[in-house]
Interface confidence: low
């Protein structure tokens, strides 16, 4: 740090005083010097370092009419809203010719009620789930001791006994408030009051109970919800893009989910109006008067195939002697799965029914028994998937072939 030489007497006639106060205080340090000739610029030092951005004002008053006469120079350093970083030793510094002069030091100190660096924050926690709260305060004066309060009740016999910066709460069963008091020699400061809202635990063990082509029955185990009964649970289902689109940690599905509410108990819900043979992802959250639990992870599920919902369309059957030609079109109704083929049945008035599996073709030529003289022949067709046969078409009579 610069030092004044001993060759000449110090020009300072007034040195900075001392300031001690609480945070936020505003104060002024002042130094005065008397010099001959042109007045120098006064610099301020804190702990030996020049303050480049000091809030200082300099006043110069001539003591004579000639520039070479003496001048009185007064510099004032304003400290607004005193902070810990403002504390230290303050001096004035001037350069006169080839010499450097510094004033006697003044001291700025901070002393008051504790100041919070960190206070407990509002948060939500699942019932009976451990969590931590933080509180940190400083002086001076030190030491600062903390006392935690839960619902305005101290958690220790005195400040400094019990938890300090971090309070570990093993779990709550009701919404509670927490605050901390910071104590030092000057008194006590109380932190903000944090409200810890107790929500239901995340449901567990979400699983399928049974499944149908257009509905899934799911069940889950509710989590603890403290003193607040669950009011309902919400289940979301979303079509999987390829069955792999939603990973366990992914927060949102690719499209708007189908949302259903379940009264509880029982912790079970039948999800209807689903597509057959389709992969879905489902998740559940449960709600009490305090709010909802977190969602479970997305669970991949799949509806099974169903049978076709309608018969084949536009069936035509024409007969030419001992042969009959039958053709049809795929059912317009949903297939509810992968079409595996068609079954055809034909029967005469007094003859047994003949059943055939046609496969995926949509036409067939039938070789009729005998000379084709059987009367009142009718044909029915049904589509089938892996789940079984769809409804049979109405009987279609075989019409004699007429050359066009």
């Amino acid at each position: 740090a610069p030092r004044g030489t001993q060759a000449e007497e110090s020009p300072f006639v007034g040195n900075p005083g001392n300031i001690t106060g609480a945070r936020g205080l505003t104060g002024t340090l002042r130094c005065q010097l008397q010099v001959q000739g042109e007045p120098p610029e006064v610099h301020w030092l804190r702990d030996g370092q020049i303050l480049e951005l000091a809030d200082s004002t300099q006043t110069q008053v001539p003591l004579g009419e000639d520039e070479q006469d003496d001048w009185i120079v007064v510099s004032q350093l304003r400290i607004t809203s005193l902070q810990l970083s403002d504390t230290g030793q303050y001096q004035c510094l001037v350069f006169l010719g080839h010499q450097t002069f510094v004033s006697q030091p003044g001291y700025v100190g901070l002393e008051g009620l504790p100041y919070f660096l960190e206070e407990p924050e509002d948060r939500t926690v699942a019932a009976n789930t451990p969590f931590n709260l933080s509180c940190q305060a400083q002086g001076p004066p030190e030491p600062v001791d903390l006392l935690w309060l839960q619902d305005a009740v101290p958690l220790a016999t005195a400040p400094g006994h019990g938890p300090q910066r971090s309070l570990h709460v093993p779990g709550l069963n009701k919404t509670s408030s927490f605050s901390c008091e910071a104590h030092n020699a000057k008194g006590v400061t109380t932190s903000r009051t944090a409200t810890i809202t107790v929500l239901p635990q995340q449901p567990r063990n979400l699983h399928l109970v049974s499944r149908q082509p257009t509905e899934l029955e799911v069940a889950w185990t509710p989590g603890l919800s403290g003193i607040y009964p669950l009011t309902h649970c919400t289940l979301q289902a979303v079509l999987s893009d390829d069955g792999m689109g939603i990973q366990a940690g992914e927060p949102d599905p690719p499209e708007e989910p189908l949302t259903s509410q379940a009264s509880v108990p029982p912790h079970q819900l039948r999800l209807g109006s689903l597509h057959p043979h389709t992969p879905y992802h489902i998740r559940v959250a449960c709600t009490s008067s305090q709010g909802p639990s977190s969602w479970t992870h997305w669970l991949p599920v799949e509806t099974p195939e169903g049978v076709p919902l309608g018969p084949p369309e536009n069936i035509s059957a024409t007969r030419n002697g001992s042969q009959a030609f039958v053709h049809w079109q795929e059912p317009r109704a949903p297939l509810q799965g992968t079409l595996l083929g068609y079954r055809l049945a034909y029967q005469g008035q007094d003859t047994p029914e003949v059943l055939m599996d046609i496969g995926l073709r949509q036409e067939v030529t039938l070789e009729l028994q005998g000379d084709g003289s059987v009367s009142n022949l009718t044909v029915c067709v049904a589509a089938y998937t892996a789940a079984g046969d769809g409804p049979w078409s109405l009987p279609v009579p075989l019409e004699a072939w007429r050359p066009g």
Partner: antibody, heavy 122, light 107 residues
Framework: QIQLVQSGPELKKPGETVKISCKAS????????MNWVKQAPGKGLKWMGW????????TYADDFKGRFAFSLETSASTAYLQINNLTTEDMVTYFC???????????????WGQGTSVTVSS | DIQMTQTTSSLSASLGDRVTISCRAS??????LNWYQQKPDGTVKLLIY???RLHSGVPSRFSGSGSGTDYSLTISNLELEDVATYFC?????????FGSGTKLEIK
Amino acid sequence: QIQLVQSGPELKKPGETVKISCKASGYTFTKYGMNWVKQAPGKGLKWMGWINTYTGEPTYADDFKGRFAFSLETSASTAYLQINNLTTEDMVTYFCAKGGYYSNPIYPMDYWGQGTSVTVSS
Amino acid sequence: DIQMTQTTSSLSASLGDRVTISCRASQDINNYLNWYQQKPDGTVKLLIYYISRLHSGVPSRFSGSGSGTDYSLTISNLELEDVATYFCQQGNTLPFTFGSGTKLEIK
């Protein structure tokens, strides 16, 4: 390849506790649930329940609530079956079997351990 | 609970025979029917799941069929290594339940 290796046969006295281990290899342990199945000598298979290896959540069939406990040591890819207060009724073979995907148990038990026989005798 | 019934507790067949083992569920299980093989040494293997899907490594002589409540396992060309007890199991509803088993022997 996928393997489930169970601990060896156990000889216990009535009232004692047994803990059977099932070490999995060849797949991601926490992606698939672990089922436990009981088989009395010369008898059929009886499903005891399963444990979700992702969350550690066990599900017990009604007949196995109380003295039976499923647990995990995920870092060792190992599932455990503990039976407390053994009786001669527990003198059977226990199988672990790899099962459902994450928390969805409704998949076949596609790989089985070799079985652990428990003898209970005073 | 869903009851799984295997009415045939044991059957005897000759090598090369076609053997069918049946299983009935007390209610519709939506095709979630699995078949397991337990060898005389006690080892258990999955053979077929979802009525008819062969598990990896299972020979194609094994096949499954059925729907609703009635299901069957067929071995088309019996081999010596097929001597075992066969169990059906429903995977549609918890708790899972097994049939009582059908023991297959060679004549």
